[in-house]
């Protein structure tokens, strides 16, 4: 292959070479969220389209039923972006109303769970208070970071409110990961 | 090359190795856009530095009229933050005087066009309203996502106001890609 | 190699093919800082934990004394989040009272420092004024990009006011590197 | 594919109110302006003015300023154009048209909407 | 404002042979962009306007190559090289570079 005389002869190669294009990938979009029961004080989990629009799934990474599998041993960058939005937050009213002052808040979490461990792993959180004067609100919280997972790991998107997320478009709530 | 007998012999290989510093990469950051705009033009593109400073395009992704172009058919991740500053919103006027408060707000999109194709295709769009009580406001907006592109696809970054857009420094407001 | 074959000919190769594991990289999560001082109008760098939990180094990518080491020159994804939170901003206490209304604000930095160069490079800076009319709040400001680095560079990540970081769970702030 | 509605023929009497709608799919609606072109009964086209779908803020032309009135919903991605004191010279096809990226110029059109107006 | 005149009012043409309709207008249209947003449009009897030409020379999706446009300045021209049946309808040449935006007042074409 031309190129292989610049290899200097103490290059250490820990992993086969291969090439970028086979890589385990996914860019997933959201999708009209259909109300389930979940337990108290956990968050739900998005679920999201895998193949139309935008969206997609690569190289043996798999979506099924909320979850992304990967589907090999390496570092992945993860990412996701949910836009929420809602209606006046309670805090401005309560506010007005002389009462006690606890903002209202919005949280994303990109969980990993492993079959062997009992406890997801929460790998990103973006959570923002949301006390808004405007009688609509509307914002973004945009998560990603680097993360060595194993085959099998399963990964998803958990919302405080699956109610004020905005599904109606695909550039807006997506999450994805590629294998690095 | 040394470490290839750790290639098992199954492994299956879709594309041609290559080098990653082979791979068309670009970071362009902000610089103070010309007001001479089309009043129709309610969502413009924002034009960017390509060179100086720590802006740089390489291995023939290039920076021409506002877009990057696409000089090779593959999976990139794209990435971009929007810093907007402006003097407080209607939106809390409004409020004052009891009148319908719906909020102002700021929006960015990254959007691909192909030539091939008459409309422009969002990508990634963040959007927020804006209703500070402040008499100053800030705030950046961020996006990143991997796509699949096709060579000759051209990339742009839209805003909803290209006013409030901070243009005053290269870390505040910037458009990258890179193929992975 | 197998797959060899589908290389073309004219292939340029500008770089040693190596391995993606074995490329430089690092995820550093949130410590509780230790108040240290720092000078005037200069933002304080925090500190990381670099290998329990979610934290990594490897591939001679170091981390020693609140910087991240680049071992090897070539284009890198920088990304780093924090999480702060406060008490009602003074801006909202002020605006109450009447007086001008300067607003507070949270402020992000990833700085890279190259011996050999006197002063410190910005490379991404989030900036939020905040004017909050909670009583408490909290959010995230995140950034993430490319760019050219050399070895010997440090990165650091740099804070308005260490003392409104979020500093209680490793999903919360982050900051990693990757060579691409 | 980008898709304009309009709503029905209409007919007025002289000195009424119309309200004609224009609903729009296929493409994110805030992202382009919607113009309004009339065309009298055997004569050509004119551009009556447009609306920025994104801010709501109306531009009308010196002929169409007064009792037109450009509106949105958003919500359900359509465009509105008010005719208020009707005249029988109001008595055309309206069109709802909307802008494109690059060029602010009307490629989609919808399929007009007859107001007549008659006592 | 300015004005948009066209000329012929109205192009008689042979099926298969070419057909030239000009448009001038009373002053310059190029934006202070840059670009010169002088469009055409085609509307067939019964029809809603269809966009053929935008920024005077380049074709809209789906327009077929018989369809051309050129000038610059004050003086444009929309040529169809080979007219078919599908073609007969009135054309309108359109400025979109100063408010209010102006249309011409129309050519007819129709087959001999």
């Known amino acids: 292959l031309k190129g292989q005389e610049f290899a200097p002869s103490h290059q250490q190669v820990y992993a086969p070479l291969r090439a970028d294009g086979d890589k385990p990938r996914a860019h997933l979009t959201v999708v009209r969220q259909t109300p389930t029961q979940h337990f108290k004080n956990q968050f739900p989990a998005l679920h999201w389209e895998h193949e139309l629009g935008l969206a997609f799934t690569k190289n043996r990474m798999n979506y099924t039923n909320k979850f992304l599998l990967i589907p090999e041993s390496g570092d992945y960058f993860i990412y996701s972006q949910v836009t929420f939005r809602g209606m006046t937050s309670e805090c401005s009213e309560i506010r007005q109303a002389g009462r006690p002052n606890k903002p209202d808040s919005i949280t994303v979490v990109i969980t990993k769970v492993t079959d062997s461990y009992p406890e997801p792993t929460q790998l990103l959180m973006g959570t923002k208070s949301v006390c808004e004067v405007g009688s609509n609100w509307f914002q973004p919280i945009y998560l990603g970071a680097m993360f060595s997972l194993q085959e099998g790991d399963k990964l998803m998107v958990n919302v405080s409110d699956i109610s004020l997320v905005d599904y109606t478009k695909e550039d807006k709530t997506f999450f994805g990961a590629f294998l690095l | 090359l040394k470490g290839q007998e750790f290639a098992p012999s199954h492994q299956q290989v879709y594309a041609p190795l290559r080098a990653d510093g082979d791979k068309p990469r670009a970071h362009l950051t902000v610089v103070r856009q010309t007001p001479t705009q089309h009043f129709k033009n309610q969502f413009p593109a924002l034009h960017w530095e390509h060179e100086l400073g720590l802006a740089f395009t390489k291995n023939r992704m290039n920076y021409t009229n506002k877009f990057l172009l696409i000089p090779e058919s593959g999976d990139y991740f794209i990435y971009s933050q929007v810093t907007f500053r402006g003097m407080t919103s209607e939106c809390s006027e409004i409020r004052q005087a009891g009148r319908p408060n719906k909020p102002d707000s700021i929006t960015v999109v990254i959007t691909k066009v192909t030539d091939s194709y008459p409309e422009p295709t969002q990508l990634l769009m963040g959007t927020k309203s804006v209703c500070e009580v402040g008499s100053n406001w800030f705030q950046p907006i961020y996006l990143g996502a991997m796509f699949s592109l096709q060579e000759g696809d051209k990339l742009m970054v839209n805003v909803s106001d290209i006013s409030l857009v901070d243009y005053t420094k290269e870390d505040k407001t910037f458009f990258g890609a890179f193929l992975l | 190699l197998k797959g060899q074959e589908f290389a073309p000919s004219h292939q340029q190769v500008y770089a040693p093919l190596r391995a993606d594991g074995d490329k430089p990289r690092a995820h550093l999560t949130v410590v509780r800082q230790t108040p240290t001082q720092h000078f005037k109008n200069q933002f304080p760098a925090l500190h990381w934990e670099h290998e329990l939990g979610l934290a990594f180094t490897k591939n001679r990518m170091n981390y020693t004394n609140k910087f991240l080491l680049i071992p090897e020159s070539g284009d890198y994804f920088i990304y780093s989040q924090v999480t702060f939170r406060g008490m009602t901003s003074e801006c909202s206490e002020i605006r109450q009272a009447g007086r001008p209304n300067k607003p507070d604000s949270i402020t992000v930095v990833i700085t890279k420092v190259t011996d050999s160069y006197p002063e410190p490079t910005q490379l991404l800076m989030g900036t939020k004024s905040v004017c909050e009319v909670g009583s408490n709040w909290f959010q995230p400001i995140y950034l993430g990009a490319m760019f050219s680095l050399q070895e010997g560079d440090k990165l650091m990540v740099n804070v308005s006011d260490i003392s409104l970081v979020d500093y209680t769970k490793e999903d919360k702030t982050f900051f990693g590197a990757f060579l691409l | 594919q980008v898709q304009l509605v309009q709503s029905g023929s209409e007919l007025k009497k002289p000195g009424a109110s119309v309200k004609v709608s224009c609903k729009a799919s296929?493409?994110?609606?805030?992202?382009?302006?919607m113009n309004w072109v009339r065309q009298a009964p055997g004569q050509g086209l004119e551009w009556m003015g447009w609306?920025?779908?994104?801010?709501?803020?109306?531009t009308y032309a010196d002929d169409f300023k007064g009792r037109f009135v450009f509106s949105l919903d958003t919500s359900v991605s359509t465009a509105y154009l008010q005719i208020s004191s009707l005249k029988a010279e109001d008595t055309a096809v309206y069109y709802c048209?909307?802008?494109?990226?690059?060029?602010?110029?009307?490629?989609?059109w919808g399929q007009g909407t007859l107001v007549t107006v008659s006592s | 404002d300015v004005v948009m005149t066209q000329s012929p009012l109205s192009l008689p043409v042979t099926l298969g042979q070419p057909a030239s309709i000009s448009c001038k207008s009373s002053q310059n249209i190029v934006h202070s962009d840059g670009n010169t947003y002088l469009e055409w449009f085609q509307q067939r009897p019964g029809q809603s306007p269809r966009r053929l030409i935008y920024?005077?020379?380049n074709r809209f999706s789906g327009v077929p190559d018989r369809f051309s446009g050129s000038g610059s300045g004050t003086d444009f021209t929309l040529k169809i090289s080979r007219v078919e049946a599908e073609d007969v309808g009135v054309y309108y040449c359109f400025q979109g570079s100063h408010v209010p935006l102006t249309f011409g007042g129309g050519t007819k074409v129709e087959i001999k």
């Open positions: 296929g493409y994110t609606f805030t992202l382009y302006g």
């Open positions: 920024k005077v020379s």
């Open positions: 048209a909307r802008d494109t990226a690059m060029d602010y110029a009307m490629a989609y």
């Open positions: 609306i920025n779908t994104y801010t709501g803020e109306p």
